[in-house]
Interface confidence: low
């Protein structure tokens, strides 16, 4: 078989039929050189994920249910293309397991026990293994058999196709509990006419049923969704109220050797080629001999998955958890204490060893994760491996997009009540020497520049936020001579000023000496033309205060900042010459780790915060001989962050769209899978 | 629904003990997370003490470990918070509240764990005087 070859799995004799007139349709369309179609036929979905693992296949469409068994080991398969449905304009690759409820009903989640339920049908994604899977802990035990557990949780049910026999009450609300539309209650119109008659407190189902069935607006404000928080949200507030967000189909291929773009070479002509409405002797999104063969029927293309996103990143945190309780069906005998430990997300081996001093100083109440990236980090707490890191406004908006949510700031002045009050924010400067004296912010083209990091506030997004205005484009390693800034592509002139060694050359983390703030100052004193920093770094790192041998005989009168109407200013006038304010770092958890990060943070800050007198003789937790390491050395507290409790709250209006401006130039692949799952 | 009603509260010199008692009626499952919050006027109102009525599990918020206790009482749906070596900033509002939390009983004990509270009772104030 030559390499170019696709293997796609067929799982009938009606999907082998339409494998091989998707091969012999493909051939006459596609160059010889091009991709091409090979059939291999198996018994099951989960023989060909088998197969796809064994590499005696390549690609097979499954459900989220199976993208999950493909996912787990030995298999190890990742999503590499969605099917979308809607328009091209609007594509919709996901759809949102939702909890409905009449307006004036009064409960919440926490408050299901006892209620009326309607389910689209037993088993079904949305319908039962979504809401069931979170609920499951919940649950009465003995939890088996489930539905005996679920028949005891509420005080009646419709869930189509349950034993109404052997568990009368979960049929008590759609007599006989029939599997198809003869039962009025089936499905997911069935189970919102469940709840609009009355019949029951709440429907599970998806975030489309309830448009789908009330045309008029008038109509769906009689109804809310409960939220995962235990609050309420109007129905069209889906996105930021759901059990979960669901793949609707998915080609999966190995983690490893997958061919992902092979695949996706072979189904974008494919879809040129044979999608709707292209062609009348072959269509892709059409089952002459059946329904939803080799792919759905509803499909109208296809979406290539990013590269970045695996299947736990893709199926998301609260699906994955629905499905593991449901498959393992293991909860705690007892929580372990009020908070489990948090699992801190430390950046390489500097901020690792640090961690893990805190981790024994706080006595089990912190566990450490290790990452190499930021980003990373991020993608780790996303889904469960880890809890909680401090990161730069840059990454506060990539966490953001990815789910995550802030929870504390870092407080760089000292006040009374620096607890209680978060701080406006730091200043991003640029920083020059004295003696460059002809340089200014209007003749920057083809200097050296030292950035913190790419996707950082300070060090790029506001600079390169502020270049990309005036040079309408993203080639900033054309811009710029040469440089150091941390993450760039290896091969860019922005990596070429950089002092790691081997690998670690130009890595975002502290094996890259010329990484974070100080590392861009050093890159300025001893190699670059100008730096994009913090107003505090200059100071913290002249006059003594950095013993470092680069850095201990430096003069903070040396430098200057660059002002933007093209004047210099000496570095302590940096409120009046400064490039923009940035959003002070901050602490990023998932939702339901917030609380439990808020409570031990506090408690840590308390034992080894800016308190503590002597760090050569006791834990700091914000010191580290001016490495940042796990939080910026200048922290003097972490601040409650009261209403701003969002990352478009936190970080402002101006600083998003400024961020959202250079999405454009993003070379973020965590951002571009995170607005895959949420445009 | 689950009605808390709480009792118990009253004056006391510092060093002095009261025992405050929540009874719940209604739908029991739903408290099978019971918890006393506190709230000094114009400050959030914080956890003090939670107990997981199903395991018998309690958990103290630090400020009282050694001299709080949480119980309960299974066969009257009644819990109670056993407070000794009682401090003048113990005077505060004390509230029951109840929750099969969709979480873990020990968040309810978070101060801004209030959140995940399904029910409350009315209140009933305690005063602490040196």
């Known amino acids: 078989v030559p390499d170019k070859t696709v293997r796609w799995c067929a799982v009938s004799e009606h999907e082998a039929t339409k494998c091989q007139s998707f091969r012999d349709h493909m051939k006459s369309v596609i160059p010889s050189d091009g991709p091409s179609v090979a059939c291999v036929k198996k018994a099951s979905y989960l023989d060909c994920i088998r197969a796809i693992a064994a590499n005696e296949a390549d690609a097979v469409t499954l459900d989220a249910g199976l993208v999950y068994d493909a996912y787990l080991a030995p298999n190890n398969l990742k999503p590499v293309v969605a099917e979308f449905y809607g328009s091209k304009e609007d594509p919709q690759t996901f759809y949102y397991a939702v909890a409905v409820v009449k307006k004036d009903s009064g409960f919440q989640m926490n408050q299901l026990r006892g209620k009326k339920s309607c389910h689209t049908g037993l088993g079904r994604s949305a319908g039962w293994n979504i809401p069931i899977g979170l609920l499951y802990c919940d649950l009465p035990e003995p939890r088996k058999p489930l539905e005996k557990a679920v028949a005891n949780f509420f005080s009646g049910s419709c869930a189509p196709c349950a034993d109404g026999t052997d568990f009368p009450q979960l049929c008590q609300l759609c007599p006989g509990c029939g599997c198809s539309t003869l039962n009025q209650y089936f499905g997911y119109s069935g189970a919102f006419k469940c709840l609009k008659d009355g019949a029951g407190d709440v429907a599970f189902v998806k975030h489309s049923t309830i448009f789908e069935n009330l045309a008029n607006k008038a109509d769906r404000d009689q109804y809310e969704l409960l939220c995962l928080d235990n609050t309420r949200k109007p129905v069209d507030e889906y996105k930021d109220c759901h059990l979960a967000q669901v793949p609707s189909h998915t080609v999966v291929a190995r983690s490893m050797g997958g061919k992902e773009d092979l695949i996706w070479e072979l189904l974008n002509q494919a879809q040129e080629h044979f999608g709707k409405d292209k062609s009348k002797e072959f269509q892709l999104f059409s089952s002459p001999h059946g329904k939803d063969l080799l792919f759905k029927d509803s499909a109208h293309g296809f979406l290539k998955v990013p590269p970045r996103m695996d299947a736990k990143m893709y199926l998301g945190y609260e699906y994955v958890t629905a499905i593991r309780n449901l498959r393992e069906g293991t909860c705690p005998e007892a929580p372990t204490d009020e908070c489990k430990p948090v699992k801190w997300c430390a950046l390489s081996h500097h901020e690792r060893l640090k961690c893990d001093e805190w981790s024994v100083n706080s006595v089990g109440k912190i566990e450490c994760v290790s990452a190499e990236t930021t980003e990373d980090c991020i993608a780790k707490i996303m889904n469960g491996e880890a809890d909680a890191m401090s990161l730069d406004g840059g990454f506060v908006y990539i966490a953001g997009k990815c789910g995550l949510v802030p929870v504390l700031a870092e407080n760089y002045n000292k006040s009374d009540n620096c607890e209680d009050t978060p701080e406006a924010g730091y200043f991003a400067i640029a920083v020059v020497k004295k003696s460059a004296s002809d340089l200014t912010w209007d003749n920057l083209k083809g200097k050296k520049s030292c950035h913190t990091a790419v996707g950082r506030t300070a060090g790029w997004n506001i600079p390169m936020g502020l270049l990309y205005n005036k040079i309408n484009h993203c080639r900033f390693d054309e811009f710029f001579s040469e440089g150091c800034a941390p993450g760039s592509k290896k091969d860019s002139s922005l990596c070429k000023l950089c002092m790691g060694s081997g690998l670690n050359l130009c890595e975002p983390n502290n094996k890259e000496g010329y990484y974070g703030y100080t590392g861009a100052f050093r890159c300025l004193v001893e190699k670059g033309d100008v730096a994009f920093v913090k107003h505090q770094t200059v100071p913290q790192n002249t006059g003594g205060k950095n013993p470092d041998p680069w850095a201990k005989n430096l003069n903070e009168k040396d430098y200057e900042l660059l002002c933007l109407d093209g004047t210099r200013k000496p570095v302590e006038e940096y409120a009046n010459c400064h490039l923009a304010r940035a959003p002070n770092h901050a602490v990023v958890t998932r939702k339901d780790k917030e609380a439990c990060v808020h409570k031990i943070l506090r408690q840590q800050q308390h034992l080894f915060g800016s308190n503590v007198t002597d760090c050569s003789g006791n834990f700091c937790l914000f010191r580290s001989e001016t490495k940042d390491l796990l939080f910026r050395d200048d922290t003097v507290c972490l601040a409650k962050l009261h209403d701003r409790n969002t990352y478009e709250k936190y970080l402002g209006e101006e600083y998003v769209k400024a961020v959202g401006n250079l999405r454009k130039c993003s070379t973020s692949s965590l951002l571009e899978a995170c607005t895959f799952r949420r445009p | 629904h689950v009605q808390l009603v709480e009792s118990g509260g009253g004056s006391v010199q510092a060093g002095g003990s009261l025992r405050l008692s929540c009874a719940a009626s209604g739908d029991t499952y739903s408290s099978k997370c019971m918890a006393w919050f506190r709230q000094v006027p114009g400050k959030e109102r914080e956890g003090v003490a939670a107990i997981d009525t199903s395991r018998g599990r309690a958990y103290l918020t630090d400020s009282v470990k050694g001299r709080f206790t949480i119980s309960q009482d299974n066969a009257k749906n009644t819990v109670y918070l056993q407070m000794n070596s009682l401090k003048p900033e113990d005077t505060a509002m004390y509230y029951c509240?109840?929750?099969?939390?969709?979480?873990?009983?020990?968040?309810?004990?978070?101060?801004?764990?209030?959140?995940?509270?399904?029910?409350w009772g009315q209140g009933t104030q305690v005063t602490v005087s040196s």
């Open positions: 509240a109840a929750s099969n939390t969709f979480y873990n009983c020990g968040a309810l004990n978070l101060g801004i764990g209030a959140g995940l509270v399904a029910y």
